[in-house]
């Protein structure tokens, strides 16, 4: 007997996911069933059901499988958070891209390659056909959407509503071309789910028909989604498993982007004359090693065969036959001329004195013409001429191009914190430079700091769910978890984005991090229905000296009646002295047998130099602070509550106007608590959201 | 400057409770870490305390050994001694406010463990 | 857990000549690698940070290299007041660590 494909391959999965049917006319069928295995086959040859299918959920707890007709992007339809949901949807219908010659396309380009309207494949007029979708079952022949029924060579197609031109092809790209990589693909998180000679990928959470070591679980920040080519372990570029038996693995056709930059976290700052650290970076020409043997050229096998390619070390520089460290030894080397010896270090090349001078900038740094061109992280910044899309895509107004000349650290969009540059890497798309303020320079950066110029609340209104004020006024608080306790709170102020503290992180292993959202018990309990678990992927910190972190989770936060987010103010605002503010937290209470409950504590709004008074004077605030006391003595923010948030209400709507950090004291009675002032920090926080890539839910 | 004390002769089975009193150190910046040496060994780490007041223990130092802090101090407190536990005791300032590298320590202070 | 393996435990060195320490770790730090030196009855003093970073006051001699899970401290133009035993330490995380520090080597000088 033949055995039966394993179909679940098809399906991109969301783990804890469900869908949920606002339009009452969208058809569902379920069934008992053991394995979402089983859902994906009958969900593939549409065996029983009265639709075609799109998707499925399995729910693991009733052992259930639900089919839908829809998927997460129809209308009509929302998505859900659910402990005991796995939602998959069909790959073909969700892709905007086409393998081989298309036959499996099923996505909703509608218009062909010279821009014509497609007639519906249900309609005669104008041009009479026989591709009528009850001839074509499972070819999905629906409205007028491009397809290739027959599999034809030039891929997807359509009969056109131009009486003049019967048919023409569509222009949908091969997903081999859409898919693109840096280096070694190690940071690559593309959808390409088949090898280069076509193979279909098994799921990384799959041990059929390859047991494998790369379990998802095990490796969260690998990237190990569904069935799509990853390069978890260092080869030239990403692979999978294959659902071949007789093909263990094999490497997937991803090309190079065209902006080919390096792509690690660490990655070396580029020098030329001299050497950076292990001189990982170091781009120079010497070509002999240190006794002034010649080098072998790296992309030569003689006199010394090797693997250290240009092919299989694309970041690597390896041109000609310079001094190069591709693989993280001590300094520079190269394979040798001589045949006796095989390697040598090139030694001679001196050490660089890292010092910049006295690189300053005044006021945000808008008029700085350095020519510094690292970031502070000590990445190599990228030509602005490359990002200028990227650029334009977050400012509203024409840069000054004549500025933005070569790579250095510039300020074309008004930034408040000084010069910044794009880097070309895909996880840090751009980072501040290491300058600091001029001294002696007091230009501020926001003006009227204690005058309600500029409204804190946007127009909009409070959200409340359903009408009934739920635990949703408190749903943007989350609990970070250091090694599974609880260390600091945190506010979720966008799906994947978490405001909250520097300090917050003393580990730099992400794996010793969670998100808690949804609780209010700071241990979980009775909030099981309720609470979501999320990873951390990345932190982005904030400008120099503001204590801020955004936390980017690994997956989208689901927004439902226990998860939401907070507004952000406006940038520069101020809030009215003796506003009414409240802190959260699930920190240090002072009570001995503390329940762990959510607490809350009551401020008004301060004026920094009433605040300073009430500091006795030996503390300075300045714009980026803003001063709040507590209503009752001895109430406010203390160790546990740090990254949690201040939220004031204005205009009924509430904000995140604060962050708790330490260095202020624990609640010291008659000392108003100095926080973050998020305001001074708006433009940052919404640029990073802007300009970061997140998961896809 | 960070300087321990506390340290003396205990009996097996006792506990000891060493402080680090910090000046000019402030502890809303910088985690504090202990550290010890026994003689003719090698230097190991014990526990760390961090600015929001997260600790983290060696893991052969968990249940036994206790760090804590005051504005100006931070404790180690040791059980259940073993005749293991003689060594001269550190404190050592942790550059930042996370888990990094020491750019202070103090002279020490000598436990010795014994019947 | 990321444990340390300093190689090698003692090491014997002329004066003027050059010393080659190495710490090896379990998992990969980046560059999240110190260096002290300690002499008996002192306080451990730290020579080199972010695997590669001299510390203030600290002499050129001494030089860190390394990354991901092997380092190297090389101990250039050796003087007498360099005999001491030297740690590497990573500061990278210390979830389920047994000790931050490796096994030190000792440096004597000849």
């Known amino acids: 007997q033949r055995k039966r494909r394993n179909t679940i391959h098809e399906f991109k999965k969301s783990a804890k996911t469900t869908l949920i049917k606002i339009d009452p006319a969208l058809k569902i069928k379920t069934k008992k069933v053991n394995t979402a295995d089983q859902c994906a086959n009958r969900c593939t040859r549409n065996k029983g059901l009265p639709f075609t299918c799109k998707a499925f959920v399995f729910d693991k707890a009733r052992k259930q499988c639900l089919w839908f007709p829809f998927n997460s992007m129809s209308s009509g339809v929302k998505k859900e958070f659910g402990h005991e949901f796995d939602l998959y949807e069909n790959k073909d219908y969700i892709r905007n891209c086409i393998i081989g010659k298309g036959r499996s396309y099923k996505g909703t380009v509608s218009i062909t390659k010279s821009g014509i309207k497609c007639q519906p494949w249900s309609s005669m007029i104008p041009h009479e056909h026989s591709f009528l979708p009850s001839s074509y079952r499972g070819k999905d022949l629906q409205e007028n959407y491009c397809r290739n029924p027959r599999g034809e060579e030039g891929g997807p197609w359509c009969f056109t509503s131009n009486p003049e031109v019967r048919y023409e092809v569509c222009d949908i790209p091969q997903c081999s071309e859409v898919e693109c990589m840096t280096c070694n693909g190690e940071s690559y998180r593309g959808l390409m789910d088949h090898t280069e000679s076509g193979k279909i990928c098994q799921r990384w959470d799959h041990q059929t028909p390859h047991r494998h070591k790369f379990l998802p679980e095990r490796y969260p920040d690998k990237g190990f989604d569904d069935n799509y080519c990853r390069n978890p372990d260092g080869q030239p570029r990403p692979w999978c498993y294959t659902l071949d038996p007789h093909t263990r693995w094999e490497y997937c056709a991803i090309k190079t982007c065209a902006d080919n930059t390096m792509n690690d976290t660490d990655v070396p700052l580029e020098t030329t004359e001299c050497i950076q650290g292990q001189g990982e970076g170091y781009r120079g020409t010497v070509n002999t090693i240190w006794n002034g043997i010649p080098c072998q050229r790296w992309d030569s096998q003689y006199p010394h065969e090797h693997d250290m390619t240009p092919e299989n070390f694309k970041c690597k520089d390896l041109r000609e036959n310079y001094c190069r460290n591709p693989d993280g030894s001590e300094s520079p080397w190269c394979f040798t001329t001589d045949p006796n010896i095989r390697v040598g270090y090139c030694s001679q090349i001196p050490n660089c004195d890292m010092s910049h001078g006295q690189d300053c900038y005044r006021g945000n740094g808008k008029n700085y013409m350095g020519n510094l061109s690292q970031t502070r992280s000590g990445l190599t910044c990228s030509m602005w001429d490359k990002n200028m899309e990227d650029l334009h895509r977050h400012i509203f107004w024409e840069p000054d191009a004549s500025k933005l000349n070569e790579n250095y650290c510039r300020n074309p969009d008004d930034d408040a914190h000084g010069p910044w540059c794009y880097t070309g890497n895909p996880l840090i798309p751009w980072d501040y430079c290491p300058i600091s303020r001029c001294e002696g320079d007091t230009t501020p950066t926001i003006v009227n700091l204690d005058h309600p110029v500029i409204s804190c609340a946007k127009t909009k209104q409070l959200r409340v769910v359903n009408g009934i004020p739920t635990r949703t006024n408190i749903g943007w608080m989350v609990s970070l978890r250091y090694r599974n306790k609880h260390i600091c709170g945190g506010s979720l102020i966008k799906e994947s984005w978490v405001l909250t503290a520097r300090q917050c992180f003393p580990s730099r292993d992400l794996k010793d991090y969670e998100a808690w959202l949804g609780i209010h018990d700071v241990h979980g309990r009775g909030d099981e229905k309720c609470k979501q678990v999320l990873n951390v992927s990345q932190l982005v910190y904030g400008p120099e000296g503001s204590d801020l972190v955004l936390m980017k989770l690994a997956r989208p936060a689901v927004l439902d009646d226990f998860v939401s987010t907070i507004d952000l103010p406006n940038y520069g605002c101020t809030i009215p002295e003796k506003t009414s503010c409240s802190v959260y937290g699930w920190g240090y209470t002072g009570l001995i047998n503390y329940d762990g409950l959510l607490r809350v504590a009551h401020l008004y709004i301060m004026g920094n130099e009433k605040c300073s008074q009430h500091h006795r004077g030996k503390v300075t605030l300045n714009e980026s602070e803003i001063c709040a006391g507590a209503e009752k003595i001895g109430s406010g923010p203390c160790e546990g509550d740090y990254g949690g948030p201040l939220v004031c209400e204005q205009h009924k709507m509430r904000m995140v106007l604060g962050v708790i950090v330490p260095g202020r004291g624990c609640a010291i009675p008659n000392r108003p608590g100095i926080f973050v002032r998020v305001a001074y920090y708006a433009k940052w926080i919404h640029k990073i959201i802007l300009t970061y890539k997140v998961p896809q839910s | 400057s960070l300087e321990e004390s506390g340290g003396r002769l205990v009996t097996p089975g006792g506990s000891l409770t060493l402080t680090c009193t910090v000046s000019?150190?402030?502890?809303?910046?910088?985690?504090i870490s202990w550290v010890r040496q026994a003689p003719e060994k090698g230097l190991e780490w014990i526990a760390v305390?961090?600015?929001?007041?997260a600790t983290d223990y060696a893991s052969w130092a968990k249940g036994r050994f206790t760090i804590s802090r005051t504005s100006t101090t931070v404790d180690l407190k040791m059980t259940s001694l073993t005749t293991e536990d003689t060594a001269t005791y550190f404190c050592?300032?942790?550059?930042?406010?996370?888990?990094?590298?020491?750019?202070?320590w103090g002279p020490g202070t000598l436990v010795t463990v014994s019947s | 857990a990321y444990d340390m393996t300093q190689t090698p435990a003692s090491v014997e060195v002329a004066v003027g000549g050059t010393v080659t320490i190495k710490c090896q770790v379990s998992q990969s730090i980046s560059s999240w690698l110190s260096w002290y030196q300690k002499k008996p009855g002192q306080r451990p003093k730290l020579l080199i940070y972010r695997a590669s970073t001299l510390a203030s006051g600290v002499s050129s001699r001494f030089k860190g290299s390394g990354s991901g899970t092997e380092f190297t401290l090389t101990i250039s133009g050796v003087e007498c007041a360099d005999a001491a035993t030297y740690y590497c330490q990573q500061a990278y995380s210390v979830s389920n660590v047994d000790n931050a520090f490796g096994g030190g080597t000792e440096v004597v000088v000849k």
């Open positions: 305390i961090y600015v929001v007041g």
């Open positions: 000019g150190i402030d502890l809303s910046s910088n985690a």
């Open positions: 050592a300032r942790v550059y930042d406010s996370g888990w990094n590298h020491f750019n202070l």
